[in-house]
């Protein structure tokens, strides 16, 4: 018996087609993805093949103006229209709190939404009961397939799930649910979830009875053969893990932003064992036409967005590189721009001793969610900025000891190379890392811009000195694992809305051209 699994993950509000780098579509003939194009391909496969499941592995929420305005209603509407069979909750589904998940998505979705390792407690338990499930048994042709969901246990550090949801260890929570499916005589089980490729592989290895793992969160691109676009494969598709009980378990993920549709064919024997698995992500490029009816619907919903934020704020004459491939690995000029805007927004000429009260900015690279292409006449709109900074946070002022900052920069690279969000972009700081050293001892130079000076210059960080730093409220609250900031900050004053800070700066400057200028170096 053959099953076709179509899958998406980390779509992040890319309902409309995008440029190749998943930013706003500029040249339509070269654009990719979007729900209208996705629907065309899905329907084509549904017509051609008998047993098809369309699954999403989380993080539909957050990323563009679509989410800023519609707050999840757009996710429910268009996923319903595409007739998704199931979705796993991602960490970003909690960005507007539990209420921002329940009403727009959980209540409106006509497909099951899953997570086995999220347990509700207190008054929320009865309210959310039945709105998401640990697993769902789906009829597919003459057979049934069990889908069991999971969500990153790091979600409380990454989003706003509140105090009444407990995120358990994925493997510990999944095993009893899979066992339950087995007692219900379900012998074909897919783990669908949002914890990242490393955890996906662990689930495949450790959870007895899971036949296939469909993941998300790490934006992992897997491909067999020559990849069709810019993404470099992290491994073959499917990635085969040998489980502890000796089975070959295919693990898949489909990059992010709706650029690809994961396509996996699984052959099961009569006892539900995987005999073979093969496939590849399908690049949703302009060779695939956008479905006219979904496109018309997108255009109808689009009207409200146009009203919201299409005025030009200023111009850029350089590419603003906000790609995760840059900002999570090295100094990126989008990070520099944002940090410069953050400092500019906090210029307060206090007295003759200080040119300013604060000179430093840190910004988690994972908080930069999109680049901006200068080839669109250089125009920068609020809408462009909302894609870069979609979280609706604030840029806050904190006071920290030098020793805390040193810990923060060690944390920035403690697991360097995994495309994780904690890699810091900076302003008023020069940092040098040596990655050959062990984690926790990789910062070899950390110089900071003086404030008590008439001519600003860089001096070595003093461990016992107290410094003022501008940073996102996300970091002040210990997000992305920066617990040391939350635990050790001496003062915290909340600041202005992130997009507003950057938009004001761009409006003030009129034309911008941020460079990569050696703020972050590797020895």
């Amino acid at each position: 018996w053959e099953l076709t699994i179509l899958h998406t993950n980390d779509v992040h509000s890319r309902l409309e087609q995008t440029s190749e780098d998943s930013s706003k579509c500029v040249n339509a003939s070269r654009c990719m993805g979007g729900v209208a194009r996705l629907f065309t391909k899905v329907q084509q496969i549904r017509r051609a093949e008998p047993n098809v499941l369309l699954l999403d592995a989380g993080d539909q929420y957050q990323g563009t103006i679509w989410f800023t305005v519609y707050k999840g209603a757009e996710v429910a509407h268009f996923m319903n229209a595409l007739r998704y069979d199931a979705m796993a909750l991602g960490n970003h589904e909690f960005d507007n709190g539990v209420e921002g998940l329940i009403e727009p998505l959980l209540k409106e979705a006509k497909f099951p939404i899953l997570s086995a390792n999220i347990k509700a407690k207190g008054p929320l338990a009865s309210q959310i009961s039945g709105l998401y499930l640990p697993y769902k048994v789906l009829p597919v042709g003459d057979e049934v397939v069990g889908i069991v969901g999971y969500t990153s246990k790091e979600t409380p550090f990454l989003s706003n799930p509140g105090t009444n949801l407990v995120f358990e260890d994925e493997i510990t929570a999944l095993q009893p649910e899979v066992d339950k499916l087995k007692t219900l005589n379900v012998n074909k089980i897919i783990a669908l979830g949002h914890s990242g490729f490393e955890t996906d592989k662990l689930i495949a290895q450790k959870v007895r009875g899971v036949d296939v793992v469909v993941g998300g969160h790490s934006n992992t691109f897997l491909y067999t053969g020559n990849p069709p676009s810019k993404e470099v494969p992290a491994g073959k598709y499917p990635f085969i893990v040998t489980s502890d009980d000796g089975r070959k378990v295919p693990v898949v993920q489909a990059y992010a932003f709706g650029k690809y549709l994961g396509y996996l064919k699984i052959e099961f024997d009569e006892r539900g064992n995987v005999i073979s698995s093969h496939g590849n992500p399908i690049l949703l490029n302009s060779s695939i036409p956008e479905d006219p009816s979904i496109k018309a619907d997108i255009n109808k919903w689009r009207i409200k967005l146009d009203n919201y934020s299409t005025q030009e704020l200023g111009k850029t004459i350089v590419y603003l590189d906000g790609s995760s491939q840059s900002c999570r690995f090295r100094e990126c000029n989008m990070g520099n721009l944002i940090c410069d805007a953050m400092i500019n927004n906090n210029l307060r000429h206090a007295d003759e001793m200080f040119w300013n009260h604060v000179s430093m900015c840190i910004l988690n690279g994972g908080g930069i969610r999109s680049p901006i292409d200068e080839r669109n006449n250089g125009t920068i709109t609020w809408e462009n900025l909302a894609a870069v900074l979609p979280f609706g946070g604030t840029f806050d002022l904190v006071q920290l000891k030098g020793s805390t900052l040193k810990k923060a920069f060690e944390h920035s690279v403690h697991r360097y190379g995994q495309s994780t969000g904690e890699f810091l972009q900076v302003g008023g700081i020069h940092v040098v890392y040596d990655l050959s050293r062990k984690p926790g001892d990789r910062v070899v130079k950390l110089d900071v811009l003086c404030t008590k000076c008439r001519v600003p210059s860089y001096d070595p960080l003093k461990m016992d000195e107290i410094y003022k730093v501008i940073l996102p409220n996300f970091l002040a609250n210990g997000g992305d694992g920066f617990q040391m900031i939350k635990d050790e900050l001496l003062r915290h004053d909340s600041g202005d809305q992130d997009i507003n800070v950057v938009s004001t700066y761009i409006s003030k400057m009129k034309v911008i051209y941020p460079a990569v200028e050696g703020r972050i170096k590797f020895s």
């Epitope: 509407h77 319903n80 009403e103 409106e108 009865s126 309210q127 409200k304």
Partner: antibody, heavy 123, light 108 residues
């Protein structure tokens, strides 16, 4: 201030038609689902029909299905109910009501109501 | 369709009393329930949504509770203005909306 003003009610013979209108003001009309709810004299409330903000989800009570048609004109901030093949049991006050949350595909609760228009079906 | 049953149909009480009206759903509706107050010759007025959320401008003596199939509306200390008819309404996902038959709260 949110205002909903119904019009078009009156006395009509069984089997005939009537069109009710609701003029909305004081809120962003095209962000919300809208509804018609009726109440027969001395009786309880009965939901008649609803239409989502984007008009993609239209629903009717079984008692009016196939006879009544709900529609909206977002440009005119107006909601309509076309009532055909009217019966004596359709006699009621008809209220126009605004749905609570914005941009929803399904229906919720009614946070604003008009004062109602009386439809009497009698020979 | 989901049936909503209110009890009692009529309730006699005095100013200052604590009163409770019950609403039962024929199947689980999570907490997708609203309560309305209606006075003679007037349109209904929303009091509570999502079973327990108080609509802005509604006095805090009104409260709602329950989930699944059993819900209650409580008025902690009855005021003269509260004598009216009260309706519950379910709005479970993609089900036709249905109301309870109403509870008339009258002066004892």
């Amino acid at each position: 201030e949110v205002q909903l003003v119904e019009s078009g009610g009156g006395l009509v013979q069984p089997g005939r038609s009537l069109r009710l209108s609701c003029a909305a003001s004081g809120f962003s009309f095209d962000d919300y689902a809208m509804h018609w709810v009726r109440q027969a004299p001395g009786k309880g409330l009965e939901w008649v029909s609803g239409i989502s903000w984007h008009s993609d989800n239209i629903g009717y009570a079984d008692s009016v299905k196939g006879r009544f048609t709900i529609s909206r004109d977002n440009a005119k901030n107006s909601l309509y109910l076309q009532m055909n093949s009217l019966r004596a049991e359709d006699t009621a006050f008809y209220y126009c009501a605004k749905d609570g949350p914005r941009y929803r595909g399904s229906y919720y609760y009614f946070d604003y109501w008009g004062q109602g228009t009386l439809v009497t079906v009698s020979s | 369709d989901i049936q909503m049953t209110q009890s009692p149909s009529t309730l006699s009480a005095s100013v200052g009393d604590r009163v409770t009206i019950t609403c039962r759903a024929s199947q689980s509706i999570s907490n997708w329930l609203a309560w309305y107050q209606q006075k003679p010759g007037k349109a209904p007025k929303l009091l509570i949504y999502k079973a327990s959320s108080l609509e802005s401008g509604v006095p805090s003596r009104f409260s709602g509770s329950g989930s699944g199939t059993e819900f209650t509306l409580t008025i902690s200390s009855l005021q003269p203005d509260d004598f009216a008819t009260y309706y519950c309404q379910q709005y479970n996902s993609y089900s036709p909306i249905t109301f309870g038959q109403g509870t008339r709260l009258e002066i004892k």
